[in-house]
């Protein structure tokens, strides 16, 4: 297993990272599934969207998410670098005007309706992982990743001293 960059000691750095362009550099429509091939689905209930992690029946259509990629500057002054490294951030939208948001107080992932410019809670650092997987790190809470907990998406703190390739924060993106 080989993937995530370290996450400790970045408490302020990602907060201060700047999205270098207002427009995304590219967009990609994909279905989102867990490392164990469960699908991430979105259901409209009582005028709000719920997010589920579930096994789909054979031939059942997977929900799609629009990933918008943004180039972001990783600031040298906070990380102690003399190098302003660039990284990719994403927003995830399963339906028009709704975006995944990190609710750091509740440690939850929610769908919020909002207008552009999107709030920082809607941006996630994209980590290039092993086995064709990705991980999503909160811009607003470095070291905290979107993960799976009790068949729902949740925010999970990753300690760099542990195995960073923990399966519950690994996701697969697929066009099908």
């Amino acid at each position: 297993a080989f993937g995530i960059s370290g996450v400790q000691k970045y408490t302020r750095a990602l907060h201060d990272s700047s999205i270098t362009g207002i427009s995304p550099i590219t967009e990609y429509l994909a279905s989102l599934s867990t490392y164990n091939d469960q699908s991430i689905t979105f259901a409209l209930e009582d005028e709000s969207y719920e997010i589920y992690v579930e096994d789909l029946k054979k031939d059942e259509k997977k929900d799609k998410v629009l990933l918008s990629y943004y180039e972001s500057q990783h600031p040298s002054n906070e990380s102690g670098d003399g190098v302003d490294g660039k990284m990719l951030m994403v927003t995830l939208s399963p339906t028009k005007d709704f975006w995944l948001h990190a609710n750091n107080k509740e440690h939850s992932v929610e769908l919020h309706k909002c207008e552009k410019p999107l709030p920082d809670q809607a941006f996630f650092v994209l980590h290039n992982m092993h086995s064709n997987c990705v991980s999503f790190e909160c811009k607003t809470d470095p070291g905290v990743f979107i993960g799976v907990k009790d068949n729902h998406l949740a925010l999970i703190k990753v300690d760099s001293s542990e195995n960073l390739c923990t399966e519950n924060i690994l996701f697969k993106l697929s066009e099908t």
Epitope: A1, F2, G3, I4, S5, G6, V7, Q8, K9, Y10, I25, T26, E27, Y28, A30, L67, Y69, H74, S79, G80, D81, G82, V83, G85, K86, M87, L88, V125, L126, H127, N128, M129, H130, N132, V134, S160, S161, E162, N163, L164, C165, L173
Partner: antibody, heavy 119, light 111 residues
């Protein structure tokens, strides 16, 4: 200033051993994946080994598997490459390289240390 | 492993001319909407320096004359107007899958 400084290169006989070190400064070393990349004289670049930020995950290509060991000491901000059973084809400049945040590319490189394998 | 083949091996051009360097991958380096192709410049006696990442995004502090394009298996690094200091070897590198691999390099000479 971000810096990676390699040391430990030198002349070694075939079958011999060598330990390379890479001293990191100017950044939070424990937060980055690191790699060793080598370049044989007049040739291209080859990934020799890689290690996760905590040291828990490592990678080796078949060309060095079982002969080379990558490790790190985050308290000393130092990356190591223990090389054993050295062969003529291991002769190269060895670079220490930092992975970018998010693991997309190599963003910082050392100046390299030369390993010569000859009898 | 993914094999990268660069062409030409050597490019000899005059200052101000446009340089076009190619890199072909043995299989697609695209994944989830991103092309995992990077370009590095290496001057004699120096370590490589990142120019372009994810096929078309400029590294920090890289002059605007360097640009990248392509997707799938075919990629191009363009130097719009060569400067004398661009004399170097240019390498492509894929980060789609481990082992991250490099092309053999294209040497750019300024006449």
């Amino acid at each position: 200033e971000v810096q990676l400084v390699e040391s430990g290169g030198g002349l070694v006989q075939p079958g011999g051993s060598l330990r390379l070190s890479c001293a990191a400064s100017g950044f939070t070393f424990s937060s980055y994946y690191m790699s060793w990349v080598r370049q044989a004289p007049g040739k291209g670049l080859e990934l020799v080994s890689a290690i996760s930020s905590s040291g828990g995950s490592t990678y080796y290509p078949d060309t060095v598997k079982g002969r080379f060991t990558i490790s790190r000491d985050n308290s000393k901000n130092t990356l190591y490459l223990q090389m054993g059973s050295l062969r003529a084809e291991d002769m190269a400049v060895y670079y220490c390289a930092r992975h970018s945040y998010g693991n997309w590319y190599f963003d910082v490189w050392g100046q390299g240390t030369t390993v010569t394998v000859s009898s | 492993e993914i094999v990268l083949t660069q062409s030409p091996a050597t490019l000899s051009l005059s200052p101000g001319e446009r340089a076009t360097l190619s890199c072909r991958a043995s299989e697609s380096v695209d994944n989830y909407g991103i092309s995992f192709m990077n370009w590095f410049q290496q001057k004699p006696g120096q370590a490589p320096r990142l120019l372009i990442y994810a096929a078309s995004n400029q590294g920090s502090g890289i002059p605007a004359r360097f640009s990248g394009s392509g997707s799938g298996t075919d990629f191009t690094l363009t130097i719009s107007s060569l400067e004398p200091e661009d004399t170097a070897v240019y390498f492509c590198q894929q980060s789609k899958e481990v082992p991250w691999t490099f092309g053999q390099g294209t040497k750019v000479e300024i006449k």
